[in-house]
């Protein structure tokens, strides 16, 4: 009967014996034998291994491209890739952020609810009845309209979601 | 042939603290994964912190967490093992060693294959 043999978490199994895995940051130039342990070599300048491995190769560090809006946020090390965020102005459109796209202003009529990230685009909501928003904005939030009242004056121009109310002078009685 | 030399051990008070350093000379490589481990007396050879060879990761026993630190100087060759708020129990000859194969757990002793001749480490009030 075969012999069932079972590796560590950091070993693996070559031609019947358990081998050491190669380190983070290496990779595997030669398996182990009876007599040797196994061979790796540090990843080169620009290469990384987030694994404990047994890959004859290292990766490639991640390019963050400009012309496609992105920038590095961490440079990558021997252990681990280099992480890519987008220009001021633009969010991630996926987890990898392998693409940016420009923040959505909020058009007249909306508020900014939540302001746009490196991750995520601006929440924009309708402005409710009382509110105004008047420009197209990454941040402006919907503004009460003013209270003619409060100014001893009388509406001459309601207010919708878009403008404020217009306030003037309280005609005389006659 | 790789030779590590230790340096920086002593007798402090408890709660005091201590930096040892490992200087490494001989080897293909400007910088390999280096481990410190201790050994008291009648006891087993214990793993205390590891670094990867870039430095880039650090490994610490449950025992050393918090209180100790484990850094390198790729230029001058040379690891460093910071310990504060030392305790008695942390009386031990300390060691360093180097792993040239890259390969193999960082907290056991036989993935290391050379080693330095020990610092002895003595606290006590």
């Known amino acids: 009967l075969g012999q069932c043999v079972t590796c560590s978490d950091k070993q693996y199994l070559h031609d019947g014996q358990c081998c050491d895995l190669c380190q983070p940051g290496s990779r595997l130039t030669s398996h182990c034998t009876a007599l040797e342990k196994t061979q790796c070599h540090p990843c080169d300048s620009g290469e990384f291994s987030a694994q404990w491995n047994r890959e004859i190769r290292c990766h490639q560090h991640r390019h963050c491209e400009p012309n496609q809006g992105l920038r590095v946020k961490k440079e990558g090390t021997a252990e681990s890739d280099t992480v890519c965020t987008c220009k001021e102005g633009q969010h991630c459109t996926s987890k990898d952020c392998e693409a940016c796209a420009q923040h959505t202003p909020c058009i007249p009529g909306f508020g900014v609810m939540e302001m746009a990230t490196e991750t995520t685009d601006t929440v924009c909501h309708p402005c409710p009845v009382g509110f105004f928003s008047n420009q197209s904005s990454l941040f402006e939030k919907c503004y009460p309209w003013t209270s003619c009242e409060d100014k001893n004056l009388e509406v001459l121009q309601k207010g919708t979601s878009q403008t404020n109310v217009i306030c003037g002078l309280k005609s005389r009685m006659r | 042939q790789v030779q590590l030399v230790e340096s920086g051990g002593g007798l402090v008070q408890p709660g005091g603290s201590l930096r040892l350093s490992c200087a490494a000379s001989g080897g293909t490589f400007s910088s390999y994964p280096m481990g410190w481990f201790r050994q008291a007396p009648g006891k087993e050879r214990e793993f205390v912190a590891a670094i990867s060879w870039s430095g880039g990761s650090t490994y610490y026993a449950d025992s050393t967490k918090g209180r100790f630190t484990i850094s390198r100087d790729s230029a001058r060759n040379t690891v460093y093992l910071q310990m504060n708020s030392l305790k008695p129990e942390d009386t031990a000859v300390y060691y360093c060693?180097?792993?040239?194969?890259?390969?193999?757990?960082?907290?056991?002793?036989?993935?290391?294959?050379?080693w330095g001749q020990g610092t002895q480490v003595t606290v006590s009030s």
């Open positions: 060693a180097a792993n040239t194969h890259f390969s193999g757990a960082f907290e056991h002793a036989r993935t290391y294959d050379y």
